[in-house]
């Protein structure tokens, strides 16, 4: 058993049918010694008397808020949550496996640049009685500070009969050095509590591996005289790291016909312009990627040819 926060305790339960459970001793936080009784949640049933209460925690029915009283007055509370392990594996029931980029991916994180700021998000089908707490650091043995905000509900999606809820959190490395080579990964830890169930999820990454630039901005077309060709130009996104001479991007320019089946013409360039043939009803799209490290491509920025 360990303390999650004041008066909230997590009981680690190795569960299997007929498991004996965990013996837990609760102590009433009071100088009083006599006439103390214990109850669970809203029930008036007295579970025991005395300054300590010993309970056998076998299942969620044994978890909840234990209260000690004296003469009708509440003395203290202890909320017991369960962290369940089955077959040696901690439960991961609260969050949905996003299966990208691999199975058992519960947390996904992205950074728009090398400033040390990043966003993580996760999915659940649970709509109520749900709280998250996020901590982060660079490295784990001698951790350097990363400050995370509160997790917030960022999107709701309907998937068939079910609703899916996306939560996200923004974090910032306290002393980020954008140009430095990373040797220790960022660690992100999410505590999830649903009703009386506690679970924790972790992710470990280098900022360089989660970089995904914003799409190029100010995408423009300039027709070339007496030609079907156009000059496409764009700019680095505002959110990308500076100076651009050091934090350079490479770009992919694509001409896509109205039909998805039509052949796509693609050009790769390190410049912020390209010359392409603009077909009728086609659109031109440009996306960006770190020039020197193959992390994710940005989403496309697009303009119609007409």
């Amino acid at each position: 058993i360990w303390e999650l926060k004041k008066d909230v305790y997590v009981v680690e339960l190795d569960w299997y049918p007929d498991a004996p459970g965990e013996m837990v001793v609760l102590t009433c936080d009071t100088p009083e010694e006599d006439g103390i009784t214990w109850t669970l949640d809203q029930s008036s049933e007295v579970l025991g008397s005395g300054k300590t209460l010993t309970i056998q925690v076998k299942e969620f029915g044994d978890a909840g808020q234990y209260t000690c009283h004296k003469g009708g007055e509440v003395l203290s509370h202890s909320l017991l949550l369960l962290h369940k392990k089955e077959d040696g594996i901690w439960s991961t029931d609260i969050l949905k496996d996003q299966k990208e980029p691999k199975n058992k991916t519960f947390l996904r994180c992205e950074a728009k640049n090398y400033s040390g700021r990043f966003t993580c998000w996760w999915l659940t089908t649970i709509s109520t009685d749900l709280t998250f707490s996020v901590k982060s650091s660079r490295g784990s043995s001698d951790p350097q500070g990363v400050t995370c905000g509160a997790a917030t509900l960022s999107a709701e999606r309907v998937r068939g009969d079910n609703k899916e809820y996306e939560y996200s959190v923004e974090c910032q490395e306290d002393s980020a050095c954008p140009a430095a080579e990373e040797s220790l990964p960022i660690e992100v830890m999410v505590d999830a509590v649903h009703k009386l169930k506690y679970e924790n999820y972790t992710s470990s990454f280098f900022i360089r591996d989660i970089i995904k630039p914003d799409p190029p901005k100010n995408l423009q077309l300039k027709p070339l005289k007496n030609s079907r060709q156009v000059e496409v130009s764009w700019e680095y996104p505002d959110t990308w790291s500076t100076p651009h001479s050091y934090f350079s991007l490479t770009f992919c320019v694509q001409v896509q016909g109205k039909s998805k089946r039509e052949k796509k013409d693609r050009v790769f360039t390190d410049k912020t312009s390209a010359t392409v043939i603009c077909r009728k009803n086609a659109s031109i799209s440009v996306r960006a990627q770190d020039r020197y490290y193959s992390s994710s491509w940005s989403e496309w920025a697009s303009v119609p040819c007409s």
């Epitope: 569960w15 969620f60 089955e86 089908t125 009969d161 609703k163």
Partner: nanobody, 123 residues
Framework: EVQLVESGGGVVQAGESLRLSCAAS????????MGWFRQAPGTEREFVAA????????YYADSVKGRFTISRDNAKNTVYLQMSSLKPEDTAVYYC????????????????WGQGTQVTVSS
Amino acid sequence: EVQLVESGGGVVQAGESLRLSCAASGRIFSDYEMGWFRQAPGTEREFVAAISWRGSSTYYADSVKGRFTISRDNAKNTVYLQMSSLKPEDTAVYYCAAGRLFPSSRSRDYDYWGQGTQVTVSS
């Protein structure tokens, strides 16, 4: 919302068997842990059995252990309670319930309930 409809109840002789079914509709069935409870007249609702959302783990009340088997078919959105060696004291209304906490024998840990199906065991 999850809607639960129990079926399969009836009148049987002591020692006989009965299979209860609970069909779920609404939200995704496989997200939920499922349980069976029962209530005899003048008594509180009593836990019978529960099964995890994957179907890999089960949990039983001592009074039915070895006689009752809970199972589920996520493809059919259905949970079953196979009851054998029935006794007169098994007579009750049997309720199906869906929740997110497994294992739990406490009724308020379940979020959705069916209307119940009557099982009567005569001696």
